[in-house]
């Protein structure tokens, strides 16, 4: 007889989750010499240990300690790139500008990017049918706790000038309820972070407005300034040209504004 299984509102664990995590780990350690010492089987065991056999609405930061330990990796000052609602462009940027890093360019973020996972209380099975939804079921689910944990740590260890890429096409360019707005902003350390520089990415080709004057950007500036961190903002009117100029900064067309 099939065992009764809790039905959650969210989609289930990503298919081939164990194989995906293991393969990503191997690929990452091959490409990043400073992480070659990492034992990917141990990484998978630690990842699995964070949620297997546990009630998926009762996951804590503590559950991820073994994984966080194995994924320890530092980012040089001035090289942190945060993003909100514009992940693809942020990742395209760091693929070109190899000395800057989003969370997903670090081992921990790379392993989990775009994946869903959860287990069930008292069984060693992974739940591929459904996982808790943050809004409809519970916030202390394996995926949400993971991202909240690593996002907070990523922000609190950033130093120098920190950059953030924001989506200028959205009604709330800065959204207080996003991971950036609710977690990362509040964990930047004034003793270490001299400034936050926001890059507002324009969507429309003919959009010449100064989105740095948007009320939500002013709200971000206020939050940051109150934390004794300087704030700067730049409009990126042509994201395609912006990326092209990162690739080829000597191009004559890159000497004018982007």
């Amino acid at each position: 007889l099939p065992r009764w299984r809790q039905q959650w509102s969210g989609s289930g664990t990503t298919s081939r989750f164990p194989e995906t995590v293991l393969a990503r780990c191997v690929k990452y350690t091959e490409v990043h010499p400073e992480m070659r010492h990492v034992d990917c089987q141990s990484v998978w065991d630690a990842f699995k240990g964070a949620f297997i056999s546990k009630y998926p609405c009762n996951i804590t930061e503590e559950d991820y300690q073994p994984l966080v330990k194995l994924g320890t990796q530092t980012v040089p000052c001035n090289k942190t790139l945060l993003w909100s609602r514009i992940k693809d462009l942020a990742h395209q940027f760091t693929q070109v500008q190899r000395d800057m890093f989003t969370l997903e360019d670090m081992l921990l973020g790379y392993l989990a990017d775009d994946l869903t996972w959860c287990g069930e209380f008292n069984t060693f099975e992974i739940n591929y049918q459904s996982c808790p939804d943050w809004r409809k079921d519970c916030s202390n689910n394996p995926v949400s706790v993971f991202w909240k944990t690593v996002s907070r740590r990523f922000a609190e260890t950033a130093c120098g000038v920190v950059h953030v890429m924001l989506n200028g096409s959205r009604s709330k360019i800065f959204d207080k309820n996003s991971t950036f707005g609710s977690v990362e902003v509040h964990n930047l350390q004034p003793e270490k972070v001299q400034a936050l520089e926001a890059w507002v990415i324009h969507g429309g080709r003919e959009d010449s407005r100064d989105l740095c004057q948007d009320p939500t950007i002013k709200e971000l500036e206020s939050i940051i300034s109150k934390r004794n961190i300087r704030f700067f903002c730049k409009n990126i009117y042509r994201p395609d040209k912006f990326l092209q100029c990162v690739k080829n900064p000597e191009d004559s067309s890159c000497l004018s504004g982007i």
Epitope: T60, Q65, Q73, R153, T157
Partner: antibody, heavy 122, light 112 residues
Framework: EVQLLESGGGLVQPGGSLRLSCAAS????????MTWVRQAPGKGLEWVAV????????DYADSVKGRFTISRDNSKNTLYLQMNSLRAEDTAVYYC???????????????WGQGTLVTVSS | QSVLTQPPSASGTPGQRVTISCSGS????????VNWYQQLPGTAPKLLIY???NRPSGVPDRFSGSKSGTSASLAISGLRSEDEADYYC????????????FGGGTKLTVLG
Amino acid sequence: EVQLLESGGGLVQPGGSLRLSCAASGFTFNNYDMTWVRQAPGKGLEWVAVISYDGSDKDYADSVKGRFTISRDNSKNTLYLQMNSLRAEDTAVYYCARVYYYGFSGPSMDVWGQGTLVTVSS
Amino acid sequence: QSVLTQPPSASGTPGQRVTISCSGSNSNIGSNTVNWYQQLPGTAPKLLIYSDSNRPSGVPDRFSGSKSGTSASLAISGLRSEDEADYYCQSYDSSLSGSRVFGGGTKLTVLG
């Protein structure tokens, strides 16, 4: 409440042995690396040994290597330090501490026990 | 002889700002983060600052940490009598086996 409670200290003769215990409560013990740190009377802190969350990795200060053994029993939420061939210079208060990892920076010792005094003297 | 060097003592009067330094090398502070611990008389050490400058919850913002190159420092502003304690810096040394290293400690005296 997160707590660490050391026991097993006492007076021992040079060349003797002693086993210290550290009972953990208020947190999921098997998720954390654990460490021992000692402090000789009137002196500073000296790191002694560390053990990984699952007991598979151990590391020791040169001053105790080959004489001290760190171990843990996750089913009992207890950390141990077996001390053999004790010397007068091992006289100290021994603290156990929890090791906390942050992911993007080095770890810290975020929770400490109250310590247990080991006196090595004839 | 400690791997990390701290002044043995420091002092200040209530309300003053006091700084305690911790000097190391490229193999420890230069390439690893620094933690600071406070040890009140007759008690166990307590984590005061982690990852160079971060305060655990419950630690007053009068305490701040910073790092530059191979040196770190702990600043205490608005000094209070209850801050009288020993302060230790701690880091990791990639050139040593058993890489965890402490400074020798600084005894802070609050005068008056």
